[in-house]
Interface confidence: medium
């Protein structure tokens, strides 16, 4: 039959060439002379001339060695024609399969592969994958089947079989426990790729396994005990820097320390923070310490890491003995602000009150007193006893110095410490009113018409407080009552002045005496301008000139 089975030809053949492969034969050659030819890539199209056919015998010829890795299969067509050139057969498929020879070594895709794995992982944990390729045939032969192996491990600690590699996938896994970054931070593996499934040619590459840090080391105090001295009352004062060592990776959450005061700070006097660079614990005072209340604090501080421990680890604790140093503290007035009621106008030399301070220090220090601020100069203070006395007239109605009946004085206490310290107190004198002011009318000048005059209403003011004020009483004196009348209204806080007889235009003094509820009398002269006019007037008109 006009059929050829697929022809297998090994690559890299040694010849001699041309080499006969197979004979094309048509059974039509009994009837007529047949001429054979071939077409297709490798014959009459690129790569041309690899194959040829003997025109008359039909022998298929190979002209040169084949390379499977270049072309693995050739598909040609065989033709048979008679002498006159007429086709005697349909074109026939000729398949030439190039069979593989192990003529390529495996090649790793990289010279150096890099991977990483956490320290302390369980055996079986995958680390990384290496890959090698081989151009030879891995489907029909083992020539291109790559097998991976680990040739060597550096360092060989804790032993030389820390990793394994999957023979066919190149996946590197941990095979032993004991990966410890703090002892071996990096392994260098020489990996091999061998074709023929491990029996053939070999090539090598490097696999670098970085051991990643896990928080498997607790920070430890070094030293474990501290002594510190802190002046009392100091807030935000750095007491002590606590030092820890941690074998984990510096500046990582597994290394960064977190400090906790776990005992000894019942009054919440202290706070502790982590220094961002040194990792030290900075112990500072949150509140002022009081030497007199407690002169020594023993603190217990625990240290852990920002990251949780990956296995059960003990926590390290440090003891800090804080000695509080005595500071000469300022005397404190008791109370800090003292309110005393005193009558205004008391005689000079009269005692007002005793105002003293206490010294927080345990030593019996001597305290001396003086007045720091006395705006009106009304008071004096005994330096030894703190006795305050009047040296001027206390005047409740003095608006320059007295606000809402209160006169404010600042006093100072000084101890005899070294150096001396001072404290201040505020003395608030509530001045009790005495009836030392009579009622006064407002305004004290009026303008009024001498015909049909309008009554003049004057307001009455009294600087004193009730009951030394209204109701008021009014009386005209010095013959003023001949021309004028003065009446206090029902509410008792205004007086109405009226002109009861004709007076010629001029200015007159009206002598008005007002007395308060406590019968304190005040005589006031009202200047009354009388105008020639009717009814209401504000200023007198000029003289009328007839024409």
């Amino acid at each position: 039959d006009w059929v050829v089975a697929p022809i297998s030809v090994p690559e890299n053949g040694k010849g001699p060439f041309p080499q006969r492969l197979n004979q094309l034969k048509s059974n039509k050659d009994r009837d007529t002379k047949i001429f054979y030819s071939i077409t297709g890539p490798g014959a009459d199209s690129p790569p041309e001339g690899v194959f040829a056919v003997e025109k008359e015998t039909g022998w298929l010829l190979l002209n040169k060695p084949l390379d499977r890795e270049e072309i693995a299969k050739y598909e040609l067509f065989g033709h048979a024609v008679s002498e006159n050139g007429a086709s005697v057969e349909d074109p026939m498929n000729i398949s030439i399969i190039v069979t593989d020879q192990n003529d390529h070594k495996p090649k790793f895709t990289q010279d150096t592969f890099r991977g990483s794995v956490l320290e302390g992982v369980m055996p079986g944990t995958s680390v990384m994958q290496v890959t090698a390729t081989d151009e030879d045939d891995a489907v029909n032969t083992y020539n291109g089947v790559v097998a991976y192996s680990i040739h060597s491990q550096e360092p060989k600690e804790p032993h030389d079989l820390m990793f394994t590699i999957h023979k066919s996938t190149g996946t590197i896994s941990v095979i032993s426990s004991g990966l410890d970054r703090e002892k071996v931070p990096e392994y260098r593996l020489t990996v091999q790729a061998t074709d023929m499934d491990g029996e053939g040619s070999t090539t090598t590459a490097e696999a670098v396994v970085q051991i990643l840090d896990a928080n498997d080391n607790a920070p430890e105090f070094d030293p474990q005990k501290y002594e510190a001295h802190v002046p009392e009352n100091a807030v935000g004062h750095e007491v002590q820097r606590l030092t820890v060592t941690d074998l984990d990776a510096p500046n990582s959450p597994a290394w960064r320390a977190t400090y906790l005061i776990m005992g000894g700070d019942d009054g919440d006097h202290f706070t502790i923070t982590t220094h961002p660079e040194s990792n030290q614990g900075i112990l500072t005072t949150r509140k002022g310490l009081d030497f007199e209340a407690k002169n020594q604090h023993t603190l217990y501080v625990e240290v852990t890491n920002e990251a949780p421990f990956v296995l059960k680890l003990p926590t390290s604790t440090a003891t800090i003995v804080v000695h509080v140093e005595d500071v000469n503290e300022a005397p404190v007035f008791v109370p800090p602000s003292k309110v005393v009621e005193v009558q205004e106008g008391i005689p000079t030399g009269e005692p007002v009150c005793v105002y003293t301070a206490e010294d927080p220090d345990k030593e019996n220090q001597k305290i001396s007193y003086r007045i720091l601020r006395d705006p009106a100069g009304w008071l004096a203070m005994d330096p030894d006893s703190g006795q305050v006395t009047a040296v001027g007239t206390l005047d409740r109605e003095d608006e320059q110095f007295v606000r809402n009946n209160i006169y404010e004085v600042m006093v100072l206490a000084m101890d005899n410490g070294s150096p001396p310290t001072t404290g201040t107190g505020t003395l608030l004198l509530t001045l009790i009113d005495v009836n030392d002011h009579g009622p006064v009318p407002e305004p004290r000048q009026i303008t009024i018409c001498n015909q049909s005059p309008v009554r003049q209403v004057l307001n009455i003011t009294d600087k004193d407080l009730s009951p030394h004020t209204s109701p008021f009483q009014a009386q005209l004196t010095d013959d003023s009552d001949i021309y004028w009348t003065a009446e206090v209204n029902e509410e008792g806080d205004t007086v109405v002045l009226s002109l009861k007889k004709f007076l010629k235009q001029d200015t007159y003094d009206v002598h008005l005496s007002l007395s308060d509820h406590g019968n304190k009398e005040q005589l006031t002269v009202i200047r009354a301008t009388v105008c020639d006019c009717h009814g209401h007037v504000e200023t007198c008109p000029g003289p009328w000139k007839g024409g």
């Epitope: 430890e220 030293p223 474990q224 005990k225 003990p314 390290s316 604790t317 440090a318």
Partner: antibody
Framework: VQLVEQSGAEVVKPGASVKITCKAS????????MNWVRQRPGKGLEWIGH????????NYNGKFKGKVTLTADKSSNTAYMQLSDLTPEDSAVYFC?????????????WGQGTTVTVSS | ELVMTQTPSSLSASLGDRVTISCRAS??????LNWYQQKPDGTVKLLIY???RLHSGVPSRFSGSGSGTDYSLTISNLEQEDIATYFC?????????FGGGTKLEIK
């Protein structure tokens, strides 16, 4: 290398006192508690107390108070244990041991022990 | 004080054997349990601290486990040099206290 070395054996009479020394090297002596442990013949171990060489701070097991005084000399990296008013009951091997930490104490480095025999 | 009970007080085993020593605390000690080895010449060494952490230089055939009040020390593949008395010790409460010891001998 962290080392803790103790003084040699002592034979003393009842009622007398004895002072055992423990010399440390290879670490910051002032920064770690030094412990003392007793082992009577054929018996277990008993913690006596410890001292912080940095400041001389001490803590004692209640049963040894009055019997034992612990001191330390920072300049010579040496810890001392004085046993007073000795009786035959105090015959034992006394160990000093460096503490690893201030809490959850474990004794990381031990001296070789000093044998004290109280006998008339 | 906290009492530590160690069992057995003595045991005999063959080279290559797996040996386990137990220690019980009279109350919870929160894993602050340590193991020591005392050789026949009297020298004492720390083996394991905080229940299961191997002290530096200690062979990996030694391991520790436990929690709460019950703890154990295991030697996985007994060697001649392991002949010694083993003590447990708690460090959770003052004063620190030791177990009575386990004397290990070779059959």
């Amino acid at each position: 290398v962290q080392l803790v070395e103790q003084s040699g054996a002592e034979v003393v009479k009842p009622g007398a006192s004895v002072k055992i020394t423990c010399k440390a090297s290879g670490y910051a002596f002032s920064s770690y508690w030094m412990n003392w442990v007793r082992q009577r013949p054929g018996k277990g171990l008993e913690w006596i107390g410890h001292i912080y060489p940095g400041d001389g701070d001490t803590n004692y097991n209640g049963k040894f108070k009055g019997k034992v005084t612990l001191t330390a000399d920072k300049s010579s990296n040496t810890a001392y244990m004085q046993l007073s008013d000795l009786t035959p009951e105090d015959s034992a091997v006394y160990f000093c041991a460096r503490d690893r930490g201030s809490f959850g104490a474990w004794f990381a480095y031990w001296g070789q022990g000093t044998t004290v025999t109280v006998s008339s | 004080e906290l009492v530590m009970t160690q069992t057995p007080s003595s045991l005999s085993a063959s080279l290559g054997d797996r040996v386990t020593i137990s220690c019980r605390a009279s109350q919870d000690i929160s894993n602050y349990l340590n193991w020591y080895q005392q050789k026949p010449d009297g020298t004492v060494k720390l083996l394991i601290y905080y229940t299961s952490r191997l002290h530096s230089g200690v062979p990996s055939r030694f391991s520790g486990s436990g929690s709460g009040t019950d703890y154990s020390l295991t030697i996985s593949n007994l060697e001649q040099e392991d002949i010694a008395t083993y003590f447990c010790q708690q460090g959770n409460r003052n004063p620190p206290t030791f177990g009575g010891g386990t004397k290990l001998e070779i059959k």
